[in-house]
Every structure is written in structure tokens, then in C-alpha cells.
Interface confidence: medium
């Protein structure tokens, strides 16, 4: 099995993870994608997935979480807003293609974040973010919630990741067409 | 409906310890942050610790650390709160709570919904 | 840690009036406050978070105002059912303290 590496990126509260996972176009291109949490020693758990089948550029947001597919290019664009100390862990991206396991985008996202200059909990004092709550809806979640932790045996290139700032925050009022799924039951 | 159901009243010996479940129905668990919060007869509100159980990771207010030790089992939606070496003034009742999430803030949208509260009383 | 000071501690009104209930940070919180209201034997429950937002199905009447270091909660014309034990919480840093409580009592 690949060796698994990991990427580290240092963020503020408030500020906006913004990776961009690459895959084989034609291979994966409608496939399936999803953001996971690796926690030690348990399985890897999805937090947000793509439809099946996976539309190009269409934003598909839960909580925090939106992603978007980008088809014509190979890569999954993940953003997690408004970061809070909380959410501070082990990520990786996935694509769906059962019966099979799980095919894994390396690498894997070591996220830090920690307290802006107002320290508060996913917030930075400048941010002009809003909190918000979304009401609980029953529609049902679009991907299995756990998957195999086993390793891939061929690596894809490796994922990218941007750094916004509070200031460059996604208003998320202005994501068009957001399908909201609980994927935590 | 959200419900948390905790479990019933203790009764423990001082230098015992107890520990208090907290079961989350009608709704998502490990999306959500649990905290526990206590209050002595006749007193306020003490904030004791809080997990997000899709983390697993826990914070505890100093004054007790290293005597709370808050946990959560995501396959039954059961968050615990275990409180060792019980003297007189731990007796209270015990409150689980939860608040925020991926919607949101973790914390920032404040406890939601309340456990109806568990009575620890520790007399010898 | 974080020091919430609520004030008054009792406050005697009579149904109609308008009250006004203080809490003071020891520093600064930004909005990160949430106001619950606590009946004798039951859970708190909560009615403002982020300081000023009105919590789903609470009475308008309800409301919130200040950030940094001030703030307060106001109920602008006082109901029976209003008659209990308000609390303030800081969401700033951890622990997530609480103020001493102020009892609303009839007059």
C-alpha cells in the first residue's frame, strides 16, 4: 500500500479552508466525491458528499461545508467557512466507486486552526460573517456516512489548498442552487 | 423533536464517583457540540466541560480537570459525564446541553436544548 | 478565565413593565453571549444567542443589545410567565462561564 502523507495548513478562526482535490478526468469525472474526518484508530467519516451522479460546478452545501466539481478540470474544490479552533483535525477527499473501496485523493489535509486576535469560537472580530442556524431538514443523506480506512494503491496528485481571510469570506447567501443534506445521524 | 434524556438521580459516597449519560434522539448527534453544566442547590450555572463528538475531543474548565472526564459513544447518541473523587459541594444537578454545529458555530448559537438534569447527591 | 458579572441580582417588577437586566464581561466577548431563562426545577432555556439574535419560538418581547464588554436583555412589557431566573453565557473563550443570575420577581 502507498505510504499516506500529509499536508498541513495553519489557519485563523473566522478564515476559510479552500482545497482543491485533483482525480483522473475521464475516469472519475462523474463519480461520486466526499470530504471526510479521519479520527485515530476509527474509520474515516463523511461530512459532505456530491450527488451521484457528481454535476459539474454545482455547489452542494452542509453547514460549512460546500463542494463543488469541477468536471472540465479533474478537482474537487472543498471550502469549510467561518473555521473555529473546534474543527482543527484530519481531512481527506474520496471518491465513491462501489462495489469497490473508497479511492482516496491524496494527500491528506492536516488542518490547524487557531484563535484569531479576538479568540472567539468561529469568529474573528473583523469578520463579517454571520451565524446562522439552519433549520433540521429530514431529507436524506446522499452518501454512506463510513468507509473503509484501507489505503489505494495508486497515487493521484496531490490536493491543493488556498488560505481566504475573514475579509475574502464567501457570503454564503449568494451560493446558487444548495442542496442541504444532514449526513450526521 | 430534539430530545436529550439523561440518566436518573445518584446517590454517591464522598471520594466515589459518578457518572451521568445523556441520550440525544429526534435528531443528529455527532454534528452538534454537548457540554455539561451544573448547579448546587440555590446556586447558578457552573459550565463543567464540553465534546464534539464527531471530534472526540473534549475541554474542560480548570477547576475541574483532571476529575471530569466528558465522553461520547456516536452508535448510541449517548454523550457521559464522569465526576471522580465526589465531596459534598459536587452535589448538584447536572445538566447536558447542547449547542451549534457544521450550521453554524460550534458554541456560538448557544444550548439549545437541555437534558432534564440528573440530582448527584454525595453524602457519607 | 473569563468573569460574567450580572446585574441586578433581584430585580422586583410588577406584569407590564419594562425590564432591563445587565451583564458585564471582564473583557471583551465581541457578541459572543447568549441569554437563558431558568424556572425553579427546570432547565434553563434559551432565549438570545450572539447577543442580540432571537431564539426560535421565543416571544418577541425578548431582546438583546451590546458587544464587547456590555450588554443587556430587555423584556418590554413584562408577562406572568416571565417571572424567573434570567442568565447570561460567554461564547468567547473557554470555559464558557455564566453570570451570577438575576431573579425577576413579583412586586
Known amino acids: 500500500a502507498t505510504k499516506l502523507t500529509e499536508e498541513k495548513y495553519e489557519l485563523k478562526e473566522g478564515q476559510t479552508l479552500d482545497v482543491k482535490c485533483d482525480y483522473t478526468l475521464e475516469k472519475f469525472a462523474s463519480s461520486q466525491k466526499a470530504w471526510q474526518i479521519i479520527r485515530d484508530g476509527e474509520m474515516p467519516k463523511t461530512l459532505a458528499c456530491t450527488e451521484r451522479p457528481s454535476k459539474n460546478s454545482h455547489p452542494v452545501q452542509v453547514g460549512r461545508i460546500i463542494l463543488e466539481d469541477y468536471h472540465d478540470h479533474g478537482l474537487l474544490r472543498v471550502r469549510m467557512v467561518n473555521l473555529q479552533v473546534e474543527d482543527s483535525g484530519l481531512y481527506q477527499c474520496v471518491i465513491y466507486q462501489p462495489p469497490k473501496e473508497p479511492h482516496m485523493l491524496f494527500d491528506r489535509i492536516r488542518l490547524v486552526v487557531t484563535k484569531g486576535f479576538s479568540g472567539t469560537p468561529g469568529s474573528n472580530e473583523n469578520s463579517t460573517q454571520n451565524v446562522y442556524k439552519i433549520p433540521p431538514t429530514t431529507t436524506k443523506a446522499l452518501c454512506p456516512l463510513y468507509t473503509s480506512p484501507r489505503t489505494v494503491t495508486q497515487a493521484p496528485p496531490k490536493s491543493t489548498a488556498d488560505v481566504s481571510t475573514p475579509d475574502s469570506e464567501i457570503n454564503l447567501t449568494n451560493v446558487t442552487d444548495i442542496i442541504r443534506v444532514p449526513v450526521f445521524n | 423533536q430534539v430530545q436529550l434524556v439523561q440518566s436518573g438521580a445518584e446517590v454517591k459516597k464522598p471520594g466515589s464517583s459518578v457518572k451521568v449519560s445523556c441520550k440525544a434522539s429526534?435528531?443528529?448527534?455527532?454534528?452538534?457540540?454537548i457540554s455539561w453544566v451544573r448547579q448546587a442547590p440555590g446556586q447558578g450555572l457552573e459550565w463543567m466541560g464540553s465534546i464534539i463528538p464527531i471530534f472526540g475531543t473534549a475541554n474542560y474548565a480548570q477547576k475541574f480537570q483532571g476529575r471530569v472526564t466528558i465522553t461520547a459513544d456516536e452508535s448510541t447518541s449517548t454523550a457521559y459525564m464522569e465526576l471522580s473523587s465526589l465531596r459534598s459541594e459536587d452535589t448538584a444537578v447536572y445538566y447536558c446541553?447542547?449547542?451549534?454545529?457544521?450550521?453554524?458555530?460550534?458554541?456560538?448559537?448557544?444550548?439549545?436544548?437541555w437534558g432534564q438534569g440528573t440530582l448527584v447527591t454525595v453524602s457519607s | 478565565d473569563i468573569q460574567m458579572t450580572q446585574s441586578p441580582s433581584t430585580l422586583s417588577a410588577s406584569v407590564g413593565d419594562r425590564v432591563t437586566i445587565t451583564c458585564r464581561a471582564s473583557?471583551?466577548?465581541?457578541?459572543?453571549l447568549a441569554w437563558y431563562q431558568q424556572k425553579p426545577g427546570k432547565a434553563p432555556k434559551l432565549l438570545i444567542y450572539?447577543?442580540?439574535s432571537l431564539e426560535s419560538g421565543v416571544p418577541s418581547r425578548f431582546s438583546g443589545s451590546g458587544s464587547g464588554t456590555e450588554f443587556t436583555l430587555t423584556i418590554s412589557s413584562l408577562q406572568p410567565d416571565d417571572f424567573a431566573t434570567y442568565y447570561c453565557q460567554q461564547f468567547q473563550s473557554y470555559p464558557f462561564t455564566f453570570g451570577g443570575g438575576t431573579k425577576v420577581e413579583i412586586k
Open positions: 429526534g435528531g443528529t448527534f455527532s454534528s452538534y457540540a
Open positions: 473583557q471583551s466577548i465581541s457578541s459572543w
Open positions: 446541553a447542547r449547542s451549534g454545529g457544521y450550521s453554524s458555530s460550534w458554541y456560538g448559537t448557544g444550548y439549545d436544548y
Open positions: 450572539k447577543a442580540s
